[in-house]
């Protein structure tokens, strides 16, 4: 077709609009071009979601979303002659898809996954209120690296929860975290029904603990040195360094964003090892200190799960009690 | 050995607050949902509230509901019941409960007494 | 909501003799049934759960059964330490609900 038409000529409604699921939660709506369309219409289609939101104008008879099933979604489709938000498309055509079958109080709840140490995930889950203490469930998962849904083997139990780790490692492609991992927990018996969840690669990392390499005094500093968990870089993480010293019985926690090792007390050119001074500390008193990191939004989405803490390590010495 | 205590029952006047704790120790606390169930004197046991183990799933009984406020602090394994509004009728023993398995209550506490009077 | 009714409300039985206690639910609650027995001025302690299987701890005397909608509490050879409130519940589906309690006498 060539240039739009008049505003005021409202194009026919697409047709065959029809909806499937991919993987596990990817929804993909096709349809046809109207007929009957006018011939100096260079078609694009609007498009939103049921609650009017991501609105899209594109010249694609498509649509995809990323979404876990856990209720309906209905995408609404209409076709116009522009990219123009404010031309009138036609009639709009809704498809919809609804979630499994089953008792909404039989499905899992609190269904959530955490990336440990970008090498493997690990995602537990509470039963279902209306479900039989023998339930048997499986988890699946896909993301973009498999070519096909795969099933989690590891189930195991702690407490009240149910959980499953699978290995996922960090592909060195630039864009493997801008992905997500697609999850479904359903049962063996096919009794209850499936819940689904979507976790983002860049939320919800847990790294390993750090390892403390060193400890020195110099004059009333003390001077910490550690190894970052394998997989990350030191400007990704931010860091806690408790300090306990016996004598005083002080706990000093301090919160660290940047850990350079520029001064020359500490040992230059180690790879993936951060450093930090504390300031005041007594060295003819035995002082413990102990290190946790975090993602930070630098890199990732989320900064709220700190790893478990390093192993102690401490310097000084303790004073005999007279 | 498992165990929860709870603490902080009393006398309070009708339409008067009070927060209930409950103390547990014994077990990983952030993998147990708690639950406080009531009984009014002379009276069977009523449910009141669950807070699931990391808190994300809260429920109350209709008849708390709007009133009655569950939490949970992980970092000290307590469980709390602020208790809002409150009437006559919730004049009763408050009980902790740890859940198990597929929701019995495996472990309860001595229970405190909420007298609510003016 | 589960109902669930208990019966009888009260018993007064001798020692050594064998009691039934059965609890009836509104619908169908599979094995989602559990027995509570509480002493007087004591906290509630758990029995039998999911029906039928026995509590770590408790004696063997007592046994339950049942699914669906109808549970029994089996006390055999009463002893007089199970002088006691004896509460059902539910926790198929939310609220909880207990059945409103049989109480067994010892003569």
């Known amino acids: 077709g060539g240039g739009g038409a008049a505003p005021t000529e409202t194009q026919p409604p697409v047709t065959n609009l029809s909806v499937s699921v991919e993987n596990l939660c990817t929804v993909i709506w096709t349809w046809n071009p109207p007929e009957g369309a006018s011939s100096n219409c260079s078609l694009w289609y609007f498009s939103h979601f049921g609650d009017k939101q991501d609105k899209k104008i594109a010249p694609e008879t498509r649509r995809s979303i990323e979404v876990p099933l856990n209720e309906r979604i209905c995408l609404q489709v209409g076709s116009q002659c522009s990219t123009n938000e404010s031309e009138k498309p036609s009639i709009l055509v809704e498809k919809c898809i609804s979630p499994p079958e089953g008792d909404p109080e039989s499905a899992v709840t609190e269904l959530q996954c955490i990336w440990h140490n970008l090498s493997y995930m690990k995602c537990s889950w509470l039963p279902g209120r209306n479900t039989s203490p023998d339930t048997n469930y499986t988890l699946y998962y896909w993301h973009r690296s498999l070519e096909k849904i795969h099933q989690c083997e590891n189930i195991f139990r702690e407490g009240q929860y149910f959980g499953c780790s699978f290995d996922l490692t960090k592909v060195k492609d630039s864009s493997f975290e801008q992905h997500s991992v697609q999850i479904m927990v359903k049962d063996n018996a096919g009794k209850i029904k499936p819940s689904f969840n979507i976790v983002p690669l860049t939320s919800r990392v847990k790294p390993d603990p750090p390892h403390i390499k060193n400890l020195s005094f110099h004059n009333d500093d003390l001077y910490v040195q550690w190894e970052n968990p394998q997989n990350f870089i030191s400007r990704c993480l931010f860091y806690e360094v408790e300090v306990n010293n016996s004598q005083t019985e002080t706990h000093n926690v301090f919160y660290v964003q940047e850990a350079k090792c520029e001064n020359p007390e500490f040992e230059r050119n180690v790879e993936n090892t951060s450093c930090f001074m504390v300031p005041g500390v007594l060295p003819d008193t035995l002082n413990t200190v102990r290190i946790r990191v975090k993602t930070n939004k630098l890199c990732y989405e989320d900064d709220k799960l700190w790893s478990n803490w390093s192993q102690e390590m401490s310097i000084g010495k303790k004073r005999n009690s007279t | 050995e498992v165990q929860v205590l709870e603490s902080g029952g009393g006398l309070v006047q009708p339409g008067g607050s009070l927060r209930l704790s409950c103390a547990a120790s014994?077990?990983?606390?952030?993998?147990?949902?708690m639950t406080w169930v009531r009984q009014a004197p002379g009276k069977g046991l009523e449910w009141v509230s669950t807070i699931s183990g990391r808190g994300y799933s809260i429920y109350y009984a209709d008849s708390v509901k709007g009133r009655f406020t569950i939490s949970r602090d992980n970092s000290k394994n307590t469980v709390y019941l602020q208790m809002n509004s409150l009437r006559a009728e919730d004049t009763a023993v408050y009980y902790c409960?740890?859940?198990?398995?597929?929701?019995?209550?495996?472990?309860w506490g001595r229970g405190t007494l909420v007298t609510v009077s003016s | 909501e589960i109902v669930l009714t208990q019966s009888p409300d009260f018993q007064s039985v001798t020692p050594k003799e064998k009691v039934t206690i059965t609890c009836r639910a509104s619908?169908?609650?599979?094995?989602?049934l559990h027995w509570y027995q509480q002493k007087p001025d004591q906290s509630p302690k758990l029995l039998i759960k999911y029906a039928s299987q026995s509590f770590s701890g408790v004696p063997s005397r007592f046994s339950g059964s049942g699914s669906g909608t109808d549970f029994t509490l089996t006390i055999n050879s009463l002893e007089a330490e199970d002088a006691a409130a004896y509460y059902c519940m539910s926790s198929w589906g939310l609220p909880y609900t207990f059945g409103q309690g049989t109480k067994l006498e010892i003569k």
């Open positions: 409960a740890k859940e198990e398995g597929h929701w019995y209550f495996d472990v």
């Open positions: 619908q169908s609650i599979g094995s989602s």
């Open positions: 014994g077990f990983t606390f952030s993998n147990y949902a």
